[in-house]
């Protein structure tokens, strides 16, 4: 079922079907015998009770006040009253733009990132049974889509998709043809979600080791989901059976990015492992960043100037 009209301030365009649905509808069914009344007041005017006799354009059904269609002089405050329950709305009916297929003040703006999923579905659940056909327009030019009941666009967004999309539902009521227009202003922006990946810690790291022992070199980065982190060493990775790349660990950050950690394990350290570069690289669509590790024999550490360790 269509949800109730909870917004207290509503703007609608003249000439379109419109309805107000109060929010104690389920309650109203329970107490069928209770008196339920709709009122309107505009300006200095007192509350005037509404009924189908007050205007041929107004219809009352259970929880709903319908306008066929709504007109400029329908602007005002509307009240629904039942026992000790009251709901109030302020309705502002604005002029239709005669020179366009939509009225600028009645546009919903949406921002879609390029290459991200972009969808427009023309649906109107309340009037669904009365709708004969629906058309979708882009910048007031009709789009030729297969489904003329619920036209839909589903695609990966591109910059050319930017524009005003208007869903126009055509429906009959009491022998008259009406239309309801819902317009979206779609702005396509660049992918804003990507960060430039950051390798954590110093760019050059000297690690003190002892021959015959093992060492674990930890490379950590803050990165995007599709970014890669890997180790490069020697002429061809994997030529040294004592060197192992451990499984990457990833933890999602509260911002939806990833904290990744990849360990290079070097077992039974030999002379050939000393004073060579073990590079950890993070790569993204924005470029690469590299961090280097050099294994140095513990005894030789004294020869290395202190500033090297914080570079």
């Amino acid at each position: 079922a269509e949800s109730c009209t909870s917004r207290p301030h509503i703007t609608v365009v003249e000439g379109e079907p419109f309805y107000l649905k109060h929010c104690s509808c389920s309650l109203a069914h329970e107490i069928e015998t209770t008196t339920k009344s709709w009122y309107k007041s505009s300006g200095s005017q007192e509350h005037v009770e509404l009924n189908p006799r007050s205007s041929s354009r107004i219809a009352l059904h259970d929880c709903v006040l319908e306008f066929w269609p709504v007109e400029l002089n329908d602007t005002g405050s509307y009240f629904f009253q039942m026992k000790n329950y009251t709901q109030k709305w302020k309705l502002n009916v604005i002029r239709r733009n005669k020179h366009s297929c939509f009225t600028e003040r009645q546009v919903t703006s949406k921002i879609v990132e390029v290459k991200k999923f972009f969808q427009i579905t023309c649906e109107n659940s309340y009037y669904q049974t009365l709708v004969n056909s629906t058309s979708l327009y882009k910048n007031c030019k009709k789009l030729l889509l297969e489904n003329n009941k619920n036209p839909t666009i589903k695609k990966n967004a591109e910059f050319e998709d930017q524009g005003y999309y208007s869903c126009v539902h055509f429906l009959h009521h009491n022998g008259k043809l009406f239309n309801i227009t819902k317009t979206f202003n779609i702005t396509i922006v660049e992918d804003r979600s990507n960060i430039v990946p950051v390798l954590l810690g110093p760019k050059l790291n000297h690690v003190a080791v002892e021959l015959g022992k093992n060492v674990r070199l930890n490379c950590s980065a803050l990165l995007n989901e599709e970014d890669v982190i890997y180790w490069m060493f020697g002429e061809e990775n994997g030529s040294d059976p004592n060197i192992h790349e451990e499984k990457e660990m990833r933890i999602m950050t509260p911002e939806g990015k990833w904290h990744a950690s990849k360990v290079l394990r070097i077992e039974n350290i030999g002379e050939s492992n000393l004073n060579v570069l073990y590079n950890c690289t993070v790569a993204s669509t924005g470029g690469t960043d590299t961090k280097s590790f050099i294994l140095v024999r513990k005894a030789d550490m004294a020869d290395i100037p202190g500033h090297v360790f914080t570079r």
């Epitope: 910059f159 660049e190 992918d191 990507n194 430039v196 989901e225 599709e226 890669v228 890997y230 499984k247 990457e248 990833r250 990744a260 690289t281 790569a283 993204s284 669509t285 924005g286 470029g287 690469t288 960043d289 590299t290």
Partner: antibody, heavy 115, light 113 residues
Framework: QVQLVQSGAEVKKPGASVKVSCKAS????????ISWVRQAPGQGLEWMGW????????NYAQKLQGRVTMTTDTSTSTAYMELRSLRSDDTAVYYC????????WGRGTLVTVSS | DIVMTQSPDSLAVSLGERATINCKSS????????????LAWYQQKPGQPPKLLIY???TRESGVPDRFSGSGSGTDFTLTISSLQAEDVAVYYC?????????FGQGTKLEIK
């Protein structure tokens, strides 16, 4: 719209250098790396290297190491590729391309190396 | 370096028929951390720069007709054109962007039979 505009064709003598420019527009320049890809006449595509427009980090193909330099100027959203010590087999169309899968390409710059 | 090998080198297919191009990488381009394949397909027509068709092995680039599709994982990939059109005559390249140097296949020339 998003595009990469490259500098014009060049004719160079062996041993000389060439510098090709690639001006980006329609997107945030520093969000994407710029790769350079070349194509010798009638041949396939060869990746030369790339530069991060964000921090200037570079990564070059091994065979061009020492002869190629890639730079960027973020104030003008322009990437540059300089190739030195030109040889006849460097004759090719040089393309700049965006990102790591190349969704936007320049039109290409023909560099002819001939004595 | 990761070596990309395409097959066949050239291919002749009748209009409206299916065209299939294969690409094999010397090592896996599937990244286990996010289950993505770092592989793209390009189309190049004479005198033009290449045009991106497919990335992440199977995601079609915006504006590319849906007769183009990519499949495969790890080391074996396929580009399929479901119903060949005259404008599809071109050279097609696969490319890995898993590790630098980013490498291309040698290309497959597609012609009409």
């Amino acid at each position: 719209q998003v595009q990469l505009v490259q500098s014009g064709a060049e004719v160079k003598k062996p041993g000389a250098s060439v510098k090709v420019s690639c001006k980006a527009s329609g997107y945030t320049f520093t969000n994407f790396g710029i790769s350079w890809v070349r194509q010798a006449p009638g041949q396939g595509l060869e990746w030369m290297g790339w530069i991060s427009a964000y921090n200037g980090n570079t990564n070059y193909a091994q065979k061009l190491q020492g002869r190629v330099t890639m730079t960027t100027d973020t104030s003008t959203s322009t990437a540059y590729m300089e190739l030195r010590s030109l040889r006849s087999d460097d004759t090719a169309v040089y393309y700049c391309a965006r990102g790591w899968f190349f969704d936007i390409w320049g039109r290409g710059t023909l560099v002819t190396v001939s004595s | 370096d990761i070596v990309m090998t395409q097959s066949p080198d050239s291919l002749a297919v009748s209009l409206g028929e299916r065209a299939t191009i294969n690409c094999k990488s010397s090592q896996s381009v599937l990244y286990s951390s996010n289950n993505k394949n770092y592989l793209a397909w390009y189309q190049q027509k004479p005198g033009q720069p290449p045009k991106l068709l497919i990335y992440w092995a199977s995601t079609r680039e915006s504006g590319v007709p849906d007769r183009f599709s990519g499949s495969g994982s790890g080391t074996d990939f396929t580009l399929t054109i479901s119903s060949l059109q005259a404008e599809d005559v071109a050279v097609y390249y696969c490319q890995q962007y898993y590790r630098t140097p980013y490498t291309f296949g040698q290309g497959t020339k597609l012609e009409i039979k």
